[in-house]
Amino acid sequence: TIPPHVQKSVNNDMIVTDNNGAVKFPQLCKFCDVRFSTCDNQKSCMSNCSITSICEKPQEVCVAVWRKNDENITLETVCHDPKLPYHDFILEDAASPKCIMKEKKKPGETFFMCSCSSDECNDNIIFSEEYNTSNPDLLLVIFQ
């Protein structure tokens, strides 16, 4: 049997289909690029992004990037292909339905990033340790 997500050629174009011929629809993500943010010292924040976009490619997931430096705080919301690095980092949590922020090392700023794959999941960004996915029970909940 043909596994799901097999690439099939239709009119010489590679489109993502399952073995019954249905076409995979891209993710719906908040997509405001970089905006100034008031999100600081909170367990979670809403993006305050009013634009929900259909991602360009079916394999893309939702991404949020929170950055704080001496001058300002910004929140970036986009779609991105998890096979490709974003801001030089791999999107390791792309299969999660929730956008759980993880700190990344960037000189001169505090930098958090999350990725996820459910509708508009980068609208609610979560910093709280309660959601730390090193907890195996939570991993079961997230990936069920």
């Epitope: 399952d18 019954n20 011929g21 249905a22 076409v23 995979k24 629809f25 339905p97 459910s118 509708d119």
Partner: nanobody
């Protein structure tokens, strides 16, 4: 048998408008999300717009936001795409598509599209 019949395409000048229609049959139209996709010459399939089953929620690709409007008339089993401020890069065959299942939430959306689509050519 599910049938989706697109119409309304044609030749239009840049900056012009067109309204595409999709007549649906063979399924309970008001239970399903519907979408429009397009395939430009030599390019891949691009999803341009999505509408919820009840028509209250609409979504767009960045490439068409602010210019295209998706709508539906559940009493007529018809899906529409109003296209304004058309550009040369909007030239494509446009396809109406139906979600494979009626469920919502954190499930991967899969869509079926059939028929020949309707050709939109934007040229002066």
């Amino acid at each position: 048998e599910v049938q989706l019949l697109e119409s309304g395409g044609g030749l239009v000048q840049p900056g012009g408008s067109l309204r595409l229609s999709c007549a649906a049959s063979g399924f309970t139209f008001f239970n399903y999300e519907m979408a429009w996709a397009r395939r430009a010459p030599g390019k891949g399939l691009e999803w341009v717009s999505l509408i919820s089953a009840d028509g209250t929620r609409t979504y767009y690709a960045n490439s068409v936001r602010g210019r295209f409007t998706i709508s539906r008339d559940n009493s007529k089993n018809t899906l529409y795409l109003q296209m304004n401020s058309l550009r040369a890069e909007d030239t494509a065959v446009y396809y109406c598509a139906k979600r494979r299942d009626a469920s919502m939430g954190h499930t991967t959306r899969r869509f079926d599209y059939s028929g020949q689509g309707t050709l939109v050519t934007v040229s002066s």
